[in-house]
Structure formats: C-alpha cells, structure tokens
C-alpha cells in the first residue's frame, strides 16, 4: 500500500491501492482489508475471497456501494470509500490470505488515513453568475476568492477555464507549486501580458485580459484545488469549482456611406466622400480602401483597388488618384481628368484594427459601402452613316459592292477615329426573328476581325473589306451567291482617345439596310431541231440543225449531244438509244458510240452560231433509221475558267425512215451429215433465200458467220467458229482440239462450213448468222438487218 499518510477531506472519495509481488501461489490473488481507528484493534472491512468476512458495521456500507473493492490486476486491488467521514480516519491493513504455501516475506501492509474537515471556501457565490458585455479590443477582469482554514499545511491551485457550448478550454492556471501555466492557445497572450493572473489581498485571484478577442466569449469558471505534501509527494485532497461570469463580445458597429449617384464631365475631377459611422472611440485604427468595378458588385473578380489608406495613415494609390481624410470619420477619393473609362461603381471598404499583444494588430470590424454609381458625361461625336450599293448583282456570281459613308460634322478632330462593322441579315420569310450575322468588325486600332460567316470567303478573296476614302468603308463580294441575298448594313463606331493614348468606343451609328436581291426565276432552255432537206434516200447525206434559246441563264454557253433512238426488232423491248457525237461548251468534238469503222468520217457536228448547231451524216444507210435529237446543256461561267451547269433540254426528234419495198432475206441451215462418228467430215450449208424484189447477184453481198453450241457445253453461249465477210475474207477462231474448219461460198446464196477430222468436241448445234448488203440506186452499199 502507499507508504505516505493519505490525507482526504470529508465528503471526498478515498482510494487505497494494494498490490502483491514476488509470490509463488496462484496468479490471481485474493485480498482482505481491515480497519483500525486510532488505538483500537483491526476490524474486518472487505474481502475479495470471503463474502462473510466484513464486520456488521461495514456490511451495510458495502451493500449500499459506499465501500467497494475494485480489482485492477491479478495481483492488485483498490479499496474505494465514497463520501469519506471523520470516523474513517485511522489505519487500513491490506493482506493476502492465500499467497504461498510457505511464508516468505510480508503478507500484509498498513497505511494511515487522515480525514480533514472541509475548510476550503471558494467564491463568488452569486447566482446566476453576472454577464459582461464588451467589445473586441476592450479589457475585462474576473475575480475568484479561495481560502483554506485547514489545520495542516496545504497549498491551493487555481485554474481559470472558459466554456463555449460543449467546449472547455484552459485559460490560465496557477499550480500548487506556484507556477503559472497558460492553456493551449493562450501562451502568446500570457507571455505578452495580454492575459494575466494575479492575487488581490489574501484570498482573491484576478484574471485580467487587456484586449478581448471574439474567441474570449463564453462562461468562465474558477477551479480551486487543495494540495498537501506527504513525504515529499503532493496529493490533491479536494477540488471546488465556481461559475464566475459569462463574457459576451459585442460586434463593433461600423458603417461606410458614399453618395449614391454622381455625374461628372469628361476631363473634370471626381470627388467622392466616404463617411464612417462606428461605436468605437478607443484606440482602434481605420484602414480605408477605395475600389472600382464595372459592375454594381464589389465581390466580382473585375474589382480593382484605386487607393488605400493603411492603419499607419500611409496612402497607397494609382496615378491620377488621391486619397485624403478631413477627419477620422470622413475620407475623400479624388480622381483627376476623368474619362469614359472612369464610369462605373466605386466602393469604400473600411476595416477597424485594434492593437493586440506584442505590437500585433487584429481586425475588430469591417464594412463595405453600397456602390457610388459614377457616370462620366462627354460631348459625343455627331455624325450620320449612309450605305448604298454601288454594284448590284443581276445574277448569281455577279459582284456586289457596298459603300458605307460617314458624314461627320467635326471629322477633323484628332482625338476621334471611326471604324466599321458589317452585318448581314437574311430576308424575312415569316414573322420569325432573324438575327444579324457579323461579317467583319474593326477594332479601335483598325484591326479587322471576321465573323464566322465571312472568315473562309475573306481568306479566299471572295469577300473584300476596304477603306478607299477617309470617309468611306467598302465591302465587295466578288461572286455573289444565292445565299448572299438579303439585307446588309454597316455600323460606324466613333473612338475617343484616352489619357493613356488608348482608344475607347464612344458611339455607334447604324446605317439603314440595303437589300441585295435578284429574281430567282427558273432557268429556261428550249431546243428546236429541224431538217432542211426533208426527203432523201439511202446513201444521201442527212442534215439536222438545232436552234437553242434560253432565259434566266447568265452568259450561257452550250454543249450539244446528238442521240439516236433506234427501233429494236422485238416490239416488247424498249427502243435502243445511241449517243453518236458531242460538242462541248468549248467546241471540242468527240465521237461517242459511233463504231462504224468504215464510216469514221461519216458524221460531223459543228457550231454554226452561238445558239445554232448542225449535224451531218454522210452516206446514210437503212440501218441509220431512227429518231434523232439534240441534247443541249447550258453552262454559266463560275470563278474565271470554271463552268456551272445551268439547264439541260432535249430537242424535238427528227426521223430517218427509208420507205423501201426492197428484198426480204431469210437464212436456214442444212446438213447432209447430221449424224457422224469421230473422224468423219461434217458438212453444213447456210442457205439464203430472197423474197420480194428480184436482185441482180452483183447487187447483193453477205457477211456470214457460223456459231456452235457444243454438246459438252449446252448451257454456254454460242461460240463463233468462222466468218466470211462480203469481200470474201475468211476468219477462223482459234481451237483447242485437232479438227479443222473450212468456210466457202459455193453459190450466190449458199455457204458451206466443213469440219475435217471431227472430234467429240465438234458435236452439237450449229447456227449461221447473215448480214445482207444491197447496192442502192445511188451506187452505195446499204447494210440490212442481221438474220439468223
């Protein structure tokens, strides 16, 4: 048990620890406690082992929980006596009844306990505690009385504590050993003397705060503890606390007022006064800042400081600005030689600073005035703006030119310059609002910036913005498109030169809009074909002219294509259209699908006039029969050498129809050897018959071709075997097997195909195809329709 006498005050709790060491018995030890008042024998008090151990006197106190044993470890226990009384003064013995099997050492120990009367008095006893209301920076002091009439030599310790809501903070303590101990956060204020603790008389303890901070608000308690020294160790024997006062820190009243609206002429002085109202008359110092903003909100990022008077009365200001004070409550801002850029909102920002510990300062109040709206009036330039179109487009791709003229009454002023902005607005098609589109804008330094609509075309040189005279701005569209139709207007801005040589826009004047428009009628293209010599026979020259007329096509040039629609033998099939010859807009001729090698120069197409074209076909043949048309395309020039297709039209047809009662040819195939064996000679005859007009054999000629569908490829197309043209020339196709072919004219109307040394591959179906040629009365050969 503790060696020193334990001293306690009536009503407090007595705790005596007891522990046993260096034993061999069970790890968890049992403890018995007994008590002896001065001079009497020991009486059983409490036991961890035997329930019936305590004397009757203590049984009741044990049951009430006034006395209890608390085990703190296997080898340690604490005796707790709550609400200790003078009768509890005496000796307390702790013993371990079952430590070891054999006795080694001491198994009991005794400690003396003294119980003193409560002789500690702590005040004040005022209920409820008073409330102190003060302002930041003001001083306050709180007092607490504490005295002890103890017969023993005791020391008092005192702690000042502040409570704010649930938070408890130590302010300053005086320990029982006479040392001052500032709480966390109070160290600096204690060392600087701002927070002090001293005694007044024999029993009063004073907490002094020389300059209150907002953090000092709260309920202050004085906690006094009494200490006694026993064998060199100090013991706290009791503690008492008292609520001393509630400190309320009132916020300082501070207002800053400036005039609401001020108007000042350009070039004059702006004088603004900031009047301060405050309830502080002590040693606070003001800091005054004037700031400027374009917006009526001083918190916006655009706000800038113009001048500042610091708490040492030093002025910090920008050029042309002065700050002065007539008295401690009135501060002037003077802005010299004002210009338009000084228009805006002015604020007066005031801070009050109170001196703190260690030559430091802390802000006790802050206020910002409502804005002073300042308008700078100036003599604005007086001018008019006129817009007219010097070039109006009649068609797409024509140029447009607009001139924007400034008529200025005082254009000679050196401190005014003019710039232009060009705008486009689409023609309204309905009541919808049509917004203007910026084409170009010129800054005060005459830098030109393009709008989205015009950026690319300006870079391509299609939009040209210029200033050709001192009073005229020009806008030219090199090639006006349909999308460019609409209203154009210009805005001329006047710029005024400032003090710092910068230019500030002072006025905008809008021109009346000019409407760029042309009728967008559909392009019309009409082509008329005619045949100058309507009657002719086969072998004659066919001539056709095409006359073109157009409307709403700018500077047209024409390209011409001659096409023929030929009837196909099968009535259910559509007519076949053939492109014969063409002439482009640059008069370059091209043969299209003219494949007759014998009549390469047989067709001619030429330009007779700008709007007239002539087609000739020499040595016409019966096979040339059909409907002939001119297909004409009109082209408009675009951007120099480029062309745009404006319209295409087809002429009426001119028919070539040979009314003949000529012969009708038929062809048939006959074989003497329809069935052969490999190696035999195959003989096949193509026999032509003629019906109708009798013809001289010299006036007939034939192109004959033989085809076969071989038995090994019945699903394939016929294969050309051999042909004999009207001039008697034989052509034979290449073969992959050994048999040979021969083709000969055996009579006027018979042609013989022979297969020598036939093989399996030669078996199959054979056809002959005949194209007759007949000599016309003019002596030209006419090709007839092919027969099979």
């Amino acid at each position: 048990v503790p060696t020193a006498t334990l001293v306690r005050v009536v009503g407090t709790e007595l705790v005596i620890p007891c522990n046993v060491s260096d034993y061999d018995g069970p790890s968890e030890q049992n403890f018995d406690w007994s008590f002896s008042s001065l001079g009497s024998s020991f009486v059983e008090l409490a036991s961890t082992w035997e329930v019936g151990f305590p004397a009757q006197l203590y049984q009741e106190r044990l049951q009430r929980g006034e006395i209890l044993l608390r085990r703190t470890a296997n080898d340690a226990v604490e005796l707790h006596i709550k609400n200790v009384q003078p009768s509890d003064q005496g000796h307390y013995k702790c013993s371990t009844p079952s430590t070891d099997a054999t006795v080694q050492g001491n198994y009991e120990d005794t400690v003396q306990v003294k119980v003193l009367a409560d002789s500690l008095h702590v005040g004040p006893s005022a209920r409820p505690p008073p409330s102190l209301s003060l302002r930041e920076g003001e001083p306050f002091e709180l007092r607490c009385t504490a005295a002890s009439a103890s017969p023993l030599h005791t020391h008092l310790a005192l702690l000042w504590e502040v409570h704010r809501g649930p938070a408890r903070r130590s302010v300053l303590a005086l320990t029982h050993e006479g040392r001052f101990h500032p709480g966390l956060g109070y160290e600096q204020r204690y060392h600087s003397g701002d927070v002090r603790l001293d005694t007044v008389g024999s029993d009063a303890y004073r907490l002094s705060v020389s300059r209150a901070l907002s953090a000092d608000q709260g309920s202050y308690r004085c906690i006094v503890s009494e200490w006694i020294a026993e064998q060199g160790n100090w013991q706290e024997i009791q503690e008492k606390a008292v609520e001393v006062a509630t400190v309320v820190i009132q916020p300082s009243v501070l207002r800053a007022a400036v005039p609401k609206n001020v108007s000042v002429a350009e070039g004059k002085e702006l004088d603004l006064t900031c009047n301060i109202t405050t309830d502080r008359a002590d040693d606070v110092r003001p800091e005054v800042t004037w700031s400027f903003s374009r917006m009526p909100d001083s918190t916006l990022p655009g706000s800038r400081v113009l001048a500042r008077l610091d708490r040492d009365s030093l002025v910090h200001s920008s050029p042309h600005v002065a700050l002065s004070h007539v008295d401690a409550r009135s501060y002037h801002l003077l802005v010299r030689d004002v210009s338009k850029e000084n228009s805006g909102y002015y604020y007066c920002h005031v801070s009050l600073w109170a001196p703190g510990h260690n030559r430091s300062w802390h802000k006790v109040a802050e206020a910002v005035s409502s804005p002073a709206g300042v308008g700078v009036t100036w003599l604005e330039p007086d001018y008019q703006v006129y817009l007219n179109a010097s070039k109006v487009p009649g068609f797409a791709d024509d140029p447009t030119e607009l001139a924007c003229r400034v008529v200025d009454t005082k254009s000679g002023e050196a401190n005014v310059r003019f710039t232009v902005s060009w705008y486009y607005r689409m023609n309204r098609r309905s009541d919808n609002v049509v917004t203007s589109e910026l084409l170009a804008v010129m800054d005060g330094d005459w830098t030109l910036k393009y709008g989205e609509r015009s950026k690319q075309r300006a870079q391509d040189g299609d939009f040209i913005f210029s200033k050709e005279h001192t009073d005229t701005f020009n806008f030219r569209i090199q090639r006006t498109t349909e999308e460019d139709r609409g209203n154009y207007y210009c805005v001329v801005s006047a710029w005024t030169k400032q003090r710092n040589n910068s230019w500030v826009k002072s006025k905008d004047v809008f021109s009346k809009p000019v409407n760029i428009f042309w009728a967008l009628e559909d392009s019309v293209l009409v082509v008329k074909a005619r045949q100058p010599k309507p009657f002719f026979a086969a072998g004659n020259t066919f001539e056709m002219t095409c006359k073109v007329s157009s409307k709403n096509i700018k500077s047209p040039r024409y390209s011409v294509l001659i096409m023929a629609e030929k009837p196909v033998g099968d009535l259910s099939s559509p007519n076949e259209t053939k492109y014969i010859i063409s002439l482009d807009q640059d008069s370059v001729v091209k043969l299209e699908n003219w494949t007759d090698a014998s009549r390469v120069d047989g067709v001619v197409l030429e330009k007779v006039q700008e709007d007239e074209f002539r087609y000739r076909m020499y040595q016409t043949q019966v096979s040339d029969a059909g409907l002939y048309r001119c297909m004409v395309t009109a082209w408009s020039p675009v951007r120099g050498s480029l062309w745009r297709e404006a319209a295409t039209s087809l002429s009426n047809p001119i028919e070539i129809d040979f009314q003949t009662s000529g012969p009708i040819f038929n062809a048939s195939v006959h074989s003497d050897t329809p069935s052969v064996i490999r190696g035999d000679l195959i003989k096949l005859f193509c026999i032509i018959t003629v019906e109708g007009a009798a013809l001289d054999p010299d006036d007939m000629a034939f192109d004959v071709s033989w085809f076969a569908v071989h038995s090994f490829g019945l699903d394939k197309a016929p294969v050309l075997l051999s042909s004999l043209d009207r001039k008697g020339i034989v052509t034979t196709s290449r073969r992959d097997w050994k048999s040979d072919l021969s083709l000969e004219r055996v009579s006027v109307l018979e042609f013989l195909l022979q297969v020598h040394g036939s093989e399996d591959q030669d078996f199959g179906n054979y056809y002959c195809s005949v194209t007759p040629w007949v000599k016309s009365p003019t002596g030209s050969w006419q090709k007839e329709a092919e027969i099979h």
């Epitope: 408890r168 903070r169 953090a215 100090w234």
Partner: antibody, heavy 119, light 107 residues
C-alpha cells in the same frame, strides 16, 4: 459523424516540398483546433503542432519549427501541412487530429498520409 | 518539455487476462492525460481522456486511473481485438508529448 480525410501517399526526393491536406466533415470546422502528429516507420507518435482554426494562428514543437508550415482553407474545411526542403528523416506517416471540446484533446484522427523521401 | 514514460514496451498476454499499463510523467500533468489504442496500419483511437473519462463507444472493460504524475490504463478481461499498441499522452503543457507505447501481444 466526424471525419478527417487526408490526401494520398507521397514519394519525394530530398530537397523537394510536400503539401498534405486534411478535409474535415461532420462538425463546424472553426469550432475545433487541428493538430498534426508524426509517426516514423516502426516508431511512436510525435506531436508536431496545432493551428487555431478560428484565428489561423499556429504553434509548433521545437523539432518542427522552420521547415514545417500549417495552414487552413476555412471555406473548404481543410487544413494543410507543408514540409519544405524534405530530408530522409521526414519519411513517416503524418496524421491530422481534431482538438476536441475537452481542452483540445485529440479525439478524432485522419487515416494518415505516408510520405517517403528517397533519392 | 514533459517526458512521458511507459516503462513496459511490450506485454505477452492471454485472452481473459487483466492488464494494467503504467504511465509516468516527469511533472504533475493535472489529469490531462489521454490513452490511445493503435492497431497496425491504422490511426490512433482515443480511449480515455482526463485520465479517467471513458470515450463514447469504448468498451467498459477499459478504465483509467491515477493523478499527479502517475497514471494507469486497465483492461479487465482482455479480448483478442484488444491486441494493439497503447500510447499515453499528456496535453497539459506544450509541446504535447506521448509515451513510447506499450505493445500487447498474444502469448
């Protein structure tokens, strides 16, 4: 629920600077102070200093004066610890801890930020 | 500076044991003593403040005692989840200081 959320681990070279953040939530930031505690690998806890969140005033233990700076961003309820001119011996986990209502005892702690200083 | 000594750096314990960890201050710290529990990889957790006040949510098997310079943390019936390092900490005088820690290990 009171929470202190510290920034992520940092790997730095000697001579560099590190700035650790500690974001508070679940209570009024300016009602409690903020403390910083260092724990070197395998070692015990060492109190570095504290900041008064109401006034912004800070106090440092002697071993942490000079290169160490504690600051606040009150609007974001965040405290910062900046260590300049890092040395190898600054390798540690740094905890922020709230100074609670009872005499500023450190009642809630951040999860810690590991700072490794190595060349 | 106030020096805080935790004389026993480590203890080997068994579940169910009663454990007392002792902490001594170099000068009177007026009950401004806190006990923290720290598990590996975690932040410290406040168990006791003001030498004896148990924090909300801390099991009642933990208790604190002492005054002046001598303080103790007791765990009446040790649970396996109590295996950790325990630090005592004085917050009476700046700079605030910690004990070196006492590590509890299972036997």
């Amino acid at each position: 629920e009171v929470q202190l959320e510290e920034s992520g681990p940092e790997l730095k070279k000697p001579g560099e600077t590190v700035k650790i953040s500690c974001k508070a939530s679940g209570y009024t930031f300016t009602d409690s102070s903020m403390h910083w505690v260092k724990q070197a690998p395998g070692k015990g806890l060492k109190w570095m200093g504290w900041i008064n969140t109401e006034t912004g005033e800070s106090t440092y233990a002697d071993d942490f004066k000079g290169r160490f700076a504690v600051s606040l961003e009150t609007s974001a309820s965040t405290a910062y610890l900046q260590i300049n001119n890092l040395k190898n011996e600054d390798t540690a986990t740094y905890f922020c801890a709230r100074g609670g209502p009872n005499y500023y005892v450190m009642d809630y702690w951040g999860q810690g930020t590991s700072v490794t200083v190595s060349s | 500076d106030i020096v805080i000594t935790q004389s026993t750096p480590s203890f080997s314990v068994s579940p169910g044991d009663r454990v007392t960890i002792i902490c001594k201050a170099s000068e009177d710290i007026y009950n401004r003593l806190a006990w923290y529990q720290q598990k590996p990889g975690n932040a410290p957790r406040l168990l006791i403040s003001g030498a004896t006040s148990l924090e909300t949510g801390v099991p009642s098997r933990f208790s604190g005692s002492g005054s002046g310079k001598d303080y103790a943390l007791s765990i009446t019936s040790l649970q396996t989840e109590d295996v950790a390092t325990y630090y005592c900490h004085q917050y009476w005088s700046t700079p605030w200081t910690f004990g070196g820690g006492t590590k509890l290990e299972i036997k």
